[in-house]
């Protein structure tokens, strides 16, 4: 866990450092607490909205909160691209936009966010709890992916559109559990430190076993390199039950958002470099939900399959592939 998050490892003190013991004892808990709280700061956010006027129409919005330059965005559904997910659109900041059914319109909203309108009927129609994923390839951060879905109404017979709060809380129930575990872990860690207060203060030192993200400019098409790129992601719901949508959103009702920011990924830098990244707030309630998702995302239940990294805006090029980096 410590290795994945690149939390500095605890090392025995070196001779001659005892004099700083009091200072270190005061600082250490705060450093650890900061790391615990900021460990889940999101880097990629995903929002899924179903249009009330068109039951089979969805809008997916994704954004990247890193400071690097985005080189390619891939939107998929049914899971991450390359993990059984189906590509819906590929957006390149300079080369253009490619989209495939049931995607209707993909576009850049800003230099770091995109939107995709999906519609369909029959087999290609999206449904309430389909999982949508956005993968951002950026330089120098690497490849980041986040997934989200629109939670279905808990009562299929509802005649009025559901309000956002209950549905978001349904997701929060599970997330609070994960967050609780994380919080307990942090508190327990502090408790242990407090118990060992009389001992010499441990020295903070970056973990030597922390995996470093591959350089964004090196793209290798080999299976070995692909297997080395595992991107964690948060999957909400993957089963597809269109029936739950039938009466959930009558015509004329408001559309609503499920905001699912989560970070995923290869971090070449330590936590301090990304800890201050802002969370996109959409109302106080959603803002809280964002933060919880962020924390839950830090230690996901499972890891996605190998993802090919194309930091170049255009794919395997320059790194050798149908797109690459300059």
């Amino acid at each position: 866990m410590r290795t994945e998050a690149q939390v500095p490892a605890l090392q025995p003190p070196e001779p001659g450092l005892e004099g700083a013991m009091g200072h270190r004892t005061l600082v250490l808990p705060w450093v650890l607490l900061t790391l615990c709280v900021t460990a889940g700061t999101p880097e990629v956010w995903v929002q899924v909205r179903m249009e009330a006027t068109e039951l089979s129409s969805f809008t997916i919005r994704c954004g990247f909160l890193g400071s690097g330059s985005i080189s390619l965005v891939t939107v998929s559904w049914g899971g991450p691209n390359g993990a059984g997910g189906t590509t819906l659109a590929v957006l390149h900041p300079e080369r253009g936009i490619r989209q495939w059914a049931p995607a209707r319109q993909a576009r850049w909203e800003t230099q770091s966010s995109i939107s995709l309108i999906l519609e369909g009927s029959g087999a290609s129609s999206p449904c309430a709890n389909t999982t949508f994923c956005c993968k951002f390839a950026s330089f120098p951060e690497g490849s980041w992916e986040a997934c989200g879905s629109l939670p279905p109404s808990s009562d299929p017979g509802l005649s009025a559109p559901p309000t956002p709060a209950p549905i978001l809380r349904a997701d929060l129930a599970g997330i609070l559990g994960v967050s609780g575990v994380l919080l307990f872990g942090c508190v327990y860690l502090l408790h242990l430190l407090r118990r060992h207060k009389h001992r010499p203060a441990p020295r903070l030192q970056p973990s030597r076993t922390s995996p470093q993200a591959p350089r964004a400019r090196a793209w290798a098409p080999s299976q070995a390199s692909q297997a080395a790129l595992h991107v964690p992601y948060a999957t909400i719901n993957t089963s597809c039950r269109p029936a739950t949508l039938d009466t959930a959103h009558p015509h004329g009702g408001p559309s609503w958002w499920a905001s699912l920011p989560t970070h995923a990924a290869h971090r070449p830098q330590g936590p301090a470099a990304w800890a201050s990244t802002p969370i996109p707030a959409r109302g106080s309630f959603v803002s809280v939900e964002n933060g919880l998702y962020a924390q839950a995302g830090e230690r996901p239940p499972h890891t996605g399959p190998g993802l090919t990294l194309f930091p170049d805006p255009r794919g395997p090029r320059a790194m050798e592939g149908p797109l690459g980096v300059r």
Partner: antibody, heavy 114, light 113 residues
Amino acid sequence: EVQLQQSGPELVKPGASVKISCKASGYTFTDYSMNWVKQSHGKSLEWIGDITPNNGSPNYNQKFKDKATLTVDKSSSTVYMELRSLTSEDSAVYYCASLFFDYWGHGTTLTVSS
Amino acid sequence: DIVMTQSPSSLSVSAGEKVTMSCKSSQSLLNSGNQKNYLAWYQQKPGQPPKLLIYGASTRDSGVPDRFTGSGSGTDFTLTITSVQAEDLAVYYCQNDHTYPYTFGGGTKLEIK
């Protein structure tokens, strides 16, 4: 190294159909779509359509919607284009090109003649 | 469909000279969201497939000599070759990378005197 290997030249009779292929290597095939482009002798380039391997849902230039059918075989990393009801107007060089047209196959020459 | 119009259709220059060719689109190729122009330039030498030179209206593809420069925005674009070399003998195409269907210009044939 990325390579797009296209099938050899074809000589077919009017009214017949032909299926040409483009085998990709050197990158993760399912990650990126493939375009097909037509170039009649001494003329410009015309985009026929594209298809993404892990979706299988093609986009077509309306002009070629009734002429071309794009398919994918993921197991062999190959994209196919079938052209039907051929006429002399279909005689051209057909290229496959990767997602953003940065890699191109060498082209397949199709000659429709009786 | 977006119509791409190139001019001149052909031109003949001596090695070392500067060459400019134009490409106009019937609709703007500027993406309002990220302020990028989705226009590409290709070079096609005799008997070969086209080769990507410029994308995003002005970004050179990897390995493309810096004598090739793309410029312009919206509907008017230009490809400039500052000092033409013998190996630049080719047809140059511009392409709408903005909207389906992706349309190409008629090409500008560059001949070396």
